[in-house]
Amino acid sequence: SGPLPKPSLQALPSSLVPLEKPVTLRCQGPPGVDLYRLEKLSSSRYQDQAVLFIPAMKRSLAGRYRCSYQNGSLWSLPSDQLELVATGVFAKPSLSAQPGPAVSSGGDVTLQCQTRYGFDQFALYKEGDPAPYKNPERWYRASFPIITVTAAHSGTYRCYSFSSRDPYLWSAPSDPLELVVT
């Protein structure tokens, strides 16, 4: 019999956590697990519980996490890694749309995230989408071109800036930008 199947690991309500705000990491395996082990990678920290409640997010808790479980003497495969990001570590960038936030269906628009600091990484989030568009770009600026806009592109966008040297410490989100597709 092969290795035990991997558990799932999720962050609730989100893996993007403002400093000082709460978050819960939850490891979920099959029923009847003997022992869970939740660990922070690139560190030696772990706990033998399926749930880690963080009442106030700190910089030192940002990073990659994974979990496993044990039944008898057998360990499961590890879960997929979870990236826990602390936001609000740096001042917010500004997000703008070129040529403007109102665009005709079929047209082109570029969302641009700008910061005064020397960050080399930017992430763009559309409200309701689970994952960001990450774009390693030139220092001080990141462009996210949207070619051939459709109605599905309309919505509220925010961007974050951060450094590749500390990839789990992000800025506060930009003010929201409403993209209107006509």
């Epitope: 660990e39 990678l41 030696s44 920290r45 772990y46 880690l52 030192s60 808790l61």
Partner: nanobody, 129 residues
Framework: QVQLQESGGGLVQAGDSLRLSCAAS????????MGWFRQAPGKEREFVAA????????YYADSVKGRFTISRDNAKNTVYLQMNSLKPEDTAVYYC??????????????????????WGQGTQVTVSS
């Protein structure tokens, strides 16, 4: 509680390799952070390397980074230190040690040197030029 016994030390030439082993007795081996330390004659004991419970994370002193590799086999209750490109300044007694990990609410990711609770007797490594 865990008992530790090092082996694999010896006399080698500069540039050679050596692999140290540390056998642990005790059923909770996989609960511990395992580390290697060394003490050269007339010097303080210094940290060399550490490895997390699963082996998924490692941490090295700058002086050995890129030359030494720490690993562990939880099924065999053993931790290893592979030492390559040895230098005369690596000459020391090498100790294996075990520690509980810091909690998630600590501000540090690895046990501090004084937090290693269990120690082996040491094995001598001599590197001649």
């Amino acid at each position: 509680q865990v008992q530790l016994q090092e082996s694999g030390g010896g006399l080698v030439q500069a540039g050679d390799s050596l692999r140290l082993s540390c056998a642990a007795s005790g059923r909770t081996f996989s609960s511990y952070v395992m580390g290697w330390f060394r003490q050269a004659p007339g010097k303080e004991r210094e940290f060399v390397a550490a490895i997390s419970w699963s082996g998924g994370s490692t941490y090295y002193a700058d002086s050995v980074k890129g030359r030494f590799t720490i690993s562990r086999d939880n099924a065999k209750n053993t931790v290893y230190l592979q030492m390559n490109s040895l230098k005369p300044e690596d000459t020391a007694v090498y100790y294996c040690a075990a520690a509980d990990p810091p909690s998630f609410y600590s501000d540090y990711d690895w046990p501090r040197d004084h937090e290693y609770d269990y120690w082996g007797q040491g094995t001598q490594v001599t590197v001649s030029s």
